[in-house]
């Protein structure tokens, strides 16, 4: 919608455009209008761009009016939120950017017989892009002066210079996305595709045998299994076999049979022959043992001379018997072969909760700290270990000890500093606890032991040029005399800042005002009005850039008018033979100064930053972890002190590393158990606990220790056509298109012929960021008017 807001009106005499008084009568003495004020309201007409404004004709973009909003003179700049002085013209077409605006101030006659009368009218032709910012315009000629502001805003969910790009955020089964400032869809985490309704499967999920409907999932096709659907399912019942394709059973070495369950090497697998017997495979699951002398049985398990093999362990002595052998064990050992250590801790002889450790033919007591001796029956002197830190003395007690603390300390070992901060510090000061005392750290602007005193910042008389100083908390304010400004009243007010002069006019600062020196073709207080050169006589062609016309506002009686063939970004230079060249403004080039120079040519953006070209300027969109005009500064990711429990932080690129202390683990030293939690790996990365560290498996499009750095791969090769700039966006990308191009990859030529710029049945030819009118017979000019 196009919005216009009336800001002020100055009609000192209360006159109409025709010289009459609003109230009708003049004072015979001073010829001023009598006090019956004008009842002022405004009419607005918005139409297509006209280089020569015509008052008639339809208001093709819309028209409207205000109610009566004031008398002769009024100022509405302060009355925000008052809609009486606002006219809103909605439009349902693509905004063409260039326009002509007619604004008229009228006097309401308040009766049905007498028609309303015009006070003053202003016209303005220009170009305006959709923005929340207002553009202020002034009408400073004629009987009345008025000021108004205009802006064009896109409806909700519409974007672009033409307000014709639609994007409405959504988070449902149709799509999961937000919209960026250009109206491009940005997928929520876990989703991808043009509509952000295709789930990003688990990292590593087989594209051939796995799929997903939900982010992070991996559903296997029939015949496939595993976390990533990359393992085939073997034939049911397959024992010692594998598969390359589903339902196979390919036997491992030394296994046979349809289900690979027949052992072809029983000897190697089970080693059944004992006592040095030699094993021979005789068939699937069959074997035979050849026993050495003195042994027999299917597995050579029967010893004919039992004691020959030293069956008694741990220095036990062997006796052959009719049943084989018998062992006589050395002290501390038992069992048929003396291999069982007798438990000397049964019963437990350790007192006072001591832990018994069984030894061979004996035991050892591990005593709690307060006890000592063979069976923990003796009281230990804990004071020998010097447990008292900040104490006068240590006293040994039975099964305990006592520390006599120095002033300011407490706790069993006198190692806790008593907190002496009990709210003594005033004015939001922070308190630092000391030993047996405290100190107040005052916020700026306060002083004193308890920060009870407000510092007088005016004491040094900081205000210049007669400014009056007002003391405030941690600051002062200078109230400046007329004509001075700045925080110290150090600036003589510059009415040329910001520059009110339009169309390249030079601004001159005066004591209480400014003056604009207008270029040839413009007039008005701010040089905002195109002069109508054709109000008088016909024109004469001087050269390929200039025409002359008779004029009574120049000494020679001739006014020279320059051609606008070089458009808004250049000046025409005449050449011989009816030719011309264009002198381009900074930032533009081309025959007609229609091409924006690529200021990104020199690759000014560092550290992987993406350069977006502007008019004689550029902007760097920094890679994750970098900032600054050229992406030269590594953002300090340690600034928020992310490491807990005494961990030390080390800044990385878009990441940090915590050096954990005292057994703490995890990305931020937050856990005693695991290196991983749901926040360790970013952008859908999977975290693996590797004991003393963690490892992140990143999804496509991300890399770095915590999947925090976007790979450039989505922008390689550059998917953006027609000079568009590619910006990495995780696994995806966004194209910032050059003027004249649009679409997700800048492949669509903007329709510069919308809406119908050619008049009088002229045909519009659309080009790359330009259009040309082919006029019907009898018509000429850039728009056939």
């Amino acid at each position: 919608q196009f919005e216009l807001e009336i800001l002020s009106m100055q009609n000192v005499n209360g006159e109409l455009q025709n010289g009459n008084c609003c109230g009708g009568a003049r004072n015979p003495g001073d010829r001023k209008c009598t006090r019956d004020e004008c009842d002022t309201y405004f009419k607005v007409c918005l139409k297509e761009y006209q280089s020569r404004v015509t008052a008639g004709g339809p208001c093709s973009f819309g028209s409207g009016s205000t109610p009566v909003i004031g008398g002769n003179t009024f100022n509405l700049k302060a009355s925000r939120g008052n809609d009486r002085n606002r006219i809103v013209l909605p439009f349902s077409f693509a905004w063409p950017r260039s326009y002509t605006l007619l604004v008229e101030a009228w006097d309401s006659s308040n009766d049905t017989v007498q028609p309303d009368s015009i006070i003053e009218k202003a016209s303005h032709s220009g170009m305006i892009n959709p923005s929340r910012q207002w553009q202020t315009l002034k009408q400073n000629t004629g009987v009345a002066h008025f000021e108004y502001q205009i802006r064009v805003t896109c409806d909700d969910y519409y974007y672009g210079f033409g307000c014709n790009k639609f994007c409405r955020p959504r988070d449902d089964f149709f799509g999961h996305y937000a919209c960026d400032q250009n109206g491009n869809k940005t997928c929520m985490e876990g989703w991808m595709g043009p509509e952000c309704n295709r789930a990003i499967c688990r990292q590593g999920c087989s594209p051939k045998h796995g799929s997903c409907k939900l982010p992070g999932d991996c559903r296997c096709q029939y015949g496939w299994q595993g976390l990533y659907c990359d393992k085939c399912i073997p034939h049911p019942g397959c024992v010692h076999g594998i598969c390359n394709e589903p339902w196979q059973c390919l036997c491992e070495t030394n296994w046979g049979g349809q289900l690979c369950d027949k052992d072809l090497n029983y000897c190697g697998t089970h080693q059944p022959c004992l006592n040095g017997g030699t094993c021979s495979n005789t068939g699937p699951d069959k074997y035979q043992c050849s026993c050495p002398e003195g042994y027999s049985g299917p597995n050579c398990e029967i010893a004919e001379h039992a004691c020959l093999s030293d069956p008694c362990h741990n220095r036990g002595s062997c006796k052959e018997t009719s049943l084989g052998f018998e062992c006589e064990c050395s002290p501390g050992w038992t069992g048929p072969t003396c291999s069982t250590n007798i438990d000397d801790c049964s019963p437990n002889n350790c007192s006072h909760g001591g832990t018994c450790q069984d030894l061979v033919n004996g035991f050892k007591c591990v005593c709690p700290p307060q006890w000592t001796g063979k069976t923990c029956q003796l009281d230990a002197n804990e004071c020998e270990a010097k447990p008292c830190v900040n104490a006068k003395s240590c006293k040994n007690l039975i099964a305990s000890y006592y520390c006599d603390c120095l002033p300011g300390w407490m706790g069993q070992n006198c190692d806790i500093n008593i907190n002496d901060c009990l709210g003594q510090c005033q004015n939001d000061a922070s308190c630092r606890d000391l030993v047996n005392g405290y100190r107040c750290i005052c916020p700026p602007g306060y002083a004193g032991d308890h920060c009870e005193r407000d510092i007088d910042e005016c004491a040094s008389n900081p205000c210049l040029n007669g400014g009056h100083c007002q003391n405030e908390i941690n600051r002062f304010q200078c109230l400046c005399p007329t004509g001075f400004s700045g925080n110290l009243c150090q600036l003589d007010i510059d009415y040329c800042e910001p520059n009110p002069c339009q169309n390249g006019a030079q601004c001159y600062n005066r004591a209480s005002d400014y003056f604009c020196k207008c270029p040839e073709d413009y007039e008005g207080k701010n040089c905002s009005h195109l002069k109508d050169h054709c109000r008088t006589t016909p024109c004469e062609v001087i050269d390929s850039c200039t025409v002359a016309m008779a004029s009574n506002d120049t000494p020679e009686g001739v006014r020279y008018i320059s051609s606008n063939v070089c458009g808004p970004h250049g000046k025409c230079k005449s050449q011989s033979g009816g030719k011309f060249t264009c002198d381009c403004n900074k930032g533009f080039t081309g025959t007609y100064c229609h091409e924006n120079i690529n200021d990104c040519e020199s690759n000014p953006c560092r550290n992987g930053g993406t350069c977006i070209d502007g008019v004689n300027s550029y902007k760097c969109i920094c890679s994750d972890g970098w900032e600054g005009a050229y992406c030269e500064t590594n953002i300090n990711d340690c600034s928020q002190n992310p490491c807990h429990n005494g961990g030390t932080c080390r800044d990385l690129v878009n990441d940090f590393y915590c050096d954990c202390k005292n057994g703490w683990k995890g990305k931020t030293c937050h856990s005693r158990d695991s290196q991983c939690d749901e926040a360790t790996c970013n952008n859908g990365g999977t975290c693996y606990d590797e004991g003393d560290a963690f490892k992140c498996m990143c999804p496509g499009g991300w890399e770095g220790t915590t999947c925090n750095i976007a790979r450039n791969s989505s922008c390689l090769p550059n998917p953006c056509h027609n000079g568009g700039t590619c910006v990495v966006n995780g696994e995806s990308f966004t194209c910032v298109c050059k003027e004249g191009w649009e679409g997700p990859i800048c492949a669509q030529n903007t329709n510069d012929c919308s809406p119908h710029p050619c008049y009088n049945s002229g045909t519009c030819v659309d080009g790359d960021n330009w259009y040309r009118c082919e006029c019907a017979p009898g018509f000429a000019g850039p728009d056939c008017r």
């Epitope: 449902d172 089964f173 509509e195 999932d217």
Partner: antibody
């Protein structure tokens, strides 16, 4: 006040066709996704089809894919369901419902229209 | 497709009772879960969306909780007008699926 009014239900023979309409009022129809949900006699709710606000995307339940077509006319504030090759198991009360662009919930429902497929 | 399983399929309770109905999804659906109430011969009515957000105009005795695969609808103090059938529904991905319903009857 949001209102959704279904019409077009009735008795039809197996293999026949019907076209259901849903007239919407009380909200900006062109800003919301719309859906059809049905309920067979004595049974639970079954989602049939959905269409997003501009009509660019449509989804269907497997049981009706290829036989039913969802469409909308934003200038008339009307949602349609064209049902062809009807079967006995399509007998149900058909509800139209609107969805805001977040979370996909059905925040308003029509009163329903009964479709009976029988010979 | 994502299966939604409600339990119990029916329950008897008295006015003033605290009633809990659970809904389980066959896969994690984050918070994309909605609850509806339906009375005989009437259209369903939305109670809770996004697992725990109360639809405007719905009494505060209704509340929802859960995330991932397990969700709960709680009626803190059952009123006479609350005897009805309750359905859960997932809305993260098509096809949209409903639970089989839980009928709350007067004891």
């Amino acid at each position: 006040e949001v209102q959704l009014l279904e019409s077009g239900g009735g008795l039809v023979q197996p293999g026949g066709s019907l076209r259901l309409s849903c007239a919407a009022s009380g909200f900006t129809f062109s800003s919301y996704a719309m859906s059809w949900v049905r309920q067979a006699p004595g049974k639970g709710l079954e989602w049939v089809s959905s269409i997003e606000q501009m009509g660019w995307q449509t989804y269907y339940a497997d049981s009706v894919k290829g036989r039913f077509t969802i469409s909308r006319d934003n200038s008339k504030n009307t949602l349609y369901l064209q049902m062809n090759s009807l079967r006995a198991e399509d007998t149900a009360v058909y509800y139209c419902a609107k969805s805001p662009p977040y979370y996909g919930q059905f925040d308003y429902w029509g009163q329903g229209t009964l479709v009976t497929v029988s010979s | 497709d994502i299966q939604m399983t409600q339990s119990p399929s029916s329950l008897s309770a008295s006015v003033g009772d605290r009633v809990t109905i659970t809904c389980r999804a066959s896969q994690s659906i984050s918070s994309y879960l909605n609850w509806y109430q339906q009375k005989p011969g009437k259209a369903p009515k939305l109670l809770i969306y996004a697992a725990s957000s109360l639809q405007s105009g719905v009494p505060s005795r209704f509340s929802g909780s859960g995330s991932g695969t397990d969700f709960t609808l709680t009626i803190s103090s059952l009123q006479p007008e609350d005897f009805a059938t309750y359905y859960c529904q997932q809305s993260v991905v098509a096809p949209l699926t409903f639970g089989q319903g839980t009928k709350v009857e007067i004891k």
